[in-house]
Interface confidence: low
């Protein structure tokens, strides 16, 4: 799916109002410096591509994120604010159903959600520019390897 046509501001609003809180809840009890960011994105459509992949595609060691509250709210936001997104997810639903066996929070899932938090932060300030300067507010962000 090409995320270029999404209403990014509406998705940002959904993230700030609820999704971010659900991610924090999921990560509660985890040290903020426990995981390094290894996944990044360069612009908003690219960020949404990576967010969709990490949220909904089962991975080795973490097969159950799709039914978490933050995932359901992410799916709802994309369905509402990305034209045609819902239609592309019909085939993906079957794969998601197969993944819904047990709700187990593994360390791998925690690491994956930590990556998601980084992607969402990048989505919310894609270029991190300061007015009147070509410098970055957080130079580590520019190089995509900062810690939480």
């Amino acid at each position: 799916y090409d995320f270029t046509n999404c209403d990014f501001e509406k998705i940002k609003a959904a993230y700030l109002s609820t999704i971010s809180k659900d991610l924090i809840t999921y990560m509660s009890g985890t040290k903020s410096t426990e995981f390094n960011n290894t996944v990044s994105c360069s612009n908003r459509p690219h960020c949404l591509t990576e967010i969709q992949s990490l949220t909904f595609n089962p991975t080795a060691g973490c097969a159950s994120l799709a039914k978490e509250m933050f995932a359901m709210k992410t799916k709802a936001a994309l369905a509402i604010w990305c034209p045609g997104y819902s239609e592309t997810q019909i085939n993906a639903t079957q794969a998601m159903k197969k993944a819904r066996k047990s709700k187990v929070t593994t360390n791998k899932c925690l690491e994956q959600v930590s990556q998601l938090q980084g992607l969402w932060r990048r989505f919310n300030r894609p270029l991190l520019k300061q007015q009147g300067s070509s410098d970055y507010k957080d130079d580590d962000d520019k190089h995509h390897h900062h810690h939480h």
Partner: antibody, heavy 121, light 105 residues
Framework: EVQLVQSGAEVKKPGASVKVSCKAS????????MNWVRQAPGQRLEWMGI????????SYNQKFKGRVTLTVDKSASTAYMELSSLRSEDTAVYYC??????????????WGQGTTVTVSS | EIVLTQSPATLSLSPGERATLSCRAS?????MHWYQQKPGQAPRPWIY???NLASGVPARFSGSGSGTDYTLTISRLEPEDFAVYYC????????FGGGTKVEIK
């Protein structure tokens, strides 16, 4: 300093194709989008499409779909717009415009000087 | 496609007067950008995201609006302000309005 330098004016016959280049400098080419906008004589600006140099992803104005192709050469920091099956109404100035994210919105903050394409038999 | 309608098409005013340019979207958009264009030149960003002036734009310019109705206002026209102004949205792809030409009366 951000600069977008476009290729020179073109004169084409109806039915032919034209490929306009846009050489970017002064910023990281893959960090921002590149739009293509045209303006027929005395007419409004008309958005044609957008490309992400990062991954080559494109989105086109439906009016031009099938006739316009946007590509990039990352190594040369150059964006290209090719328009095929030219007709007289395609006579216009074609602009490339970098799209940056600032002020909570994507905006075309730097523009090329424009390339005049004349379609005439 | 979101259609942007600018009015009036032409605004004939004298230096020192107030100019109000309107841009109406066919459906709600998050923000509106404005560009200034003078004859033979490429457009220049003028107002970002509804109300933020681009670098070098004088404070006599202001932008406002939300939803489907947006406005660019010039409090006191100076000779260099006479030009064509285009609105542009990006909520759904990108489209430009038809432009408002501000000309000397």
């Amino acid at each position: 300093e951000v600069q977008l330098v476009q290729s020179g004016a073109e004169v084409k016959k109806p039915g032919a194709s034209v490929k306009v280049s846009c050489k970017a400098s002064g910023y990281t080419f893959t960090d921002d989008y590149m739009n293509w906008v045209r303006q027929a004589p005395g007419q409004r600006l008309e958005w044609m499409g957008i490309i992400s140099p990062y991954n080559g992803g494109t989105s086109y104005n439906q009016k031009f779909k099938g006739r316009v192709t946007l590509t990039v050469d990352k190594s040369a920091s150059t964006a290209y717009m090719e328009l095929s099956s030219l007709r007289s109404e395609d006579t216009a100035v074609y602009y490339c415009a970098r799209e940056d994210y600032d002020y909570d919105g994507y905006a075309m903050d730097h523009w090329g000087q424009g390339t005049t394409v004349t379609v005439s038999s | 496609e979101i259609v942007l309608t600018q009015s009036p098409a032409t605004l004939s005013l004298s230096p020192g007067e107030r100019a109000t340019l309107s841009c109406r979207a066919s459906s709600s958009v998050s923000y509106m950008h404005w560009y200034q264009q003078k004859p033979g030149q490429a457009p220049r960003p003028w107002i970002y995201a509804t109300s933020n002036l681009a670098s070098g734009v004088p404070a006599r310019f202001s932008g406002s609006g939300s939803g489907t109705d947006y406005t660019l206002t010039i409090s006191r026209l100076e000779p260099e302000d006479f030009a064509v102004y285009y609105c542009q949205q990006w909520s759904s792809n990108r489209t430009f309005g038809g432009g408002t030409k501000v000309e000397i009366k």
